[in-house]
Interface confidence: medium
């Protein structure tokens, strides 16, 4: 008979002869021959394979590095690979999430409007009238003015976006 | 000057306790979130914990969450670290750090000079 000179799914061609692919998961120790089926042995622990593959050795499962600041989200098997994420407070600096930074945070003036999350940034907002932010922080918003009126006290310092009013009593009407 | 001082470490059994402290000065320390970090023998620097100007926010690394507890008192100037169920793997320096507007894990604004924790039976 003619040598094949394609084969079926799952299957390569090799030496005019069709062998059977290696699971995911496994890897290729021999090519098939007129005798004997393709021969496998499964990846070795942190070790993966997610095809159908005549690959003769397996990936390496990815390192989640914590001095990145990376974390595993997802354990890796043999037929995945790891999946790293962020640790809180961090957030990736690519799609592939291959290191992480620490939210960035809003000066004086400014408060947070989103806190940040894995994959995104902290949002700053400039405080608004009436709200001040003394701080440099990636996790607080603007806050209020203290309101004077309703500890019985008067304004004796005006508030800016950075900072409160100051409050101070009344003065006495004299007779 | 930013001076930080980091205070508490030293030798303990596996699953004891430690308090870290670490007072600030030359700086509003009110005005910024802190950093706590360590680094193991032989390691890179791990980030630790986050918390936030006023408190209100804190975060932790997966390998200390629910026996790490980070805290601060703003009257005192001061950060704390509470550590419970101490394992062999947090042996290592730890450092309080000025939390900067941007940076990786070698590069906060300002460190302490850390002080030293081992857990061993």
């Known amino acids: 008979p003619e040598p094949p000179t394609a084969c079926r799914e799952k299957q390569y061609l090799i030496n005019s002869q069709c062998c059977s692919l290696c699971q995911p998961g496994q890897k290729l120790v021999s090519d098939c021959t007129e005798f004997t089926e393709t021969e496998c042995l499964p990846c070795g622990e942190s070790e993966f394979l997610d095809t159908w593959n005549r690959e003769t050795h397996c990936h390496q499962h990815k390192y989640c590095d914590p001095n990145l600041g990376l974390r595993v989200q997802q354990k890796g098997t043999s037929e995945t690979d790891t999946i790293c994420t962020c640790e809180e407070g961090w957030h990736c600096t690519s799609e592939a999430c291959e290191s992480c930074v620490l939210h960035r945070s809003c000066s004086p003036g400014f408060g947070v409007k989103q806190i940040a999350t894995g994959v995104s940034d902290t949002i700053c907002e400039p405080c608004p009238v009436g709200f001040f932010s003394n701080v440099s922080s990636a996790f607080e918003k603007c806050h209020p003015w203290t309101s004077c009126e309703t500890k019985d006290l008067v304004v004796q310092q005006a508030g800016t976006n950075k900072t409160d009013v100051v409050c101070g009593p009344q003065d006495r009407l004299r007779a | 000057e930013v001076q930080l001082l980091e205070s508490g470490g030293g030798l303990v059994q596996p699953g004891g306790s430690l308090r870290l402290s670490c007072a600030a000065s030359?700086?509003?320390?009110?005005?910024?979130?802190m950093q706590w970090v360590r680094q193991a023998p032989g390691k890179g620097l791990e980030w630790v914990s986050t918390?936030?100007?006023?408190?209100?926010?804190?975060y932790y690394a997966d390998s200390v969450k629910g026996r790490f507890t980070t805290s601060r008192d703003n009257s005192k100037n001061t950060l704390y670290l509470q550590m419970n169920s101490l394992r062999a793997e947090d042996t290592a320096v730890y450092y309080c750090?000025?939390?900067?507007?941007?940076?990786?894990?070698?590069?906060?604004?300002?460190w302490g000079q850390g002080t030293l924790v081992t857990v061993s039976s």
């Open positions: 030359g700086f509003t320390f009110s005005g910024y979130d």
């Open positions: 918390i936030s100007a006023s408190g209100v926010f804190t």
């Open positions: 750090a000025k939390y900067p507007n941007r940076f990786a894990l070698n590069n906060f604004d300002y």
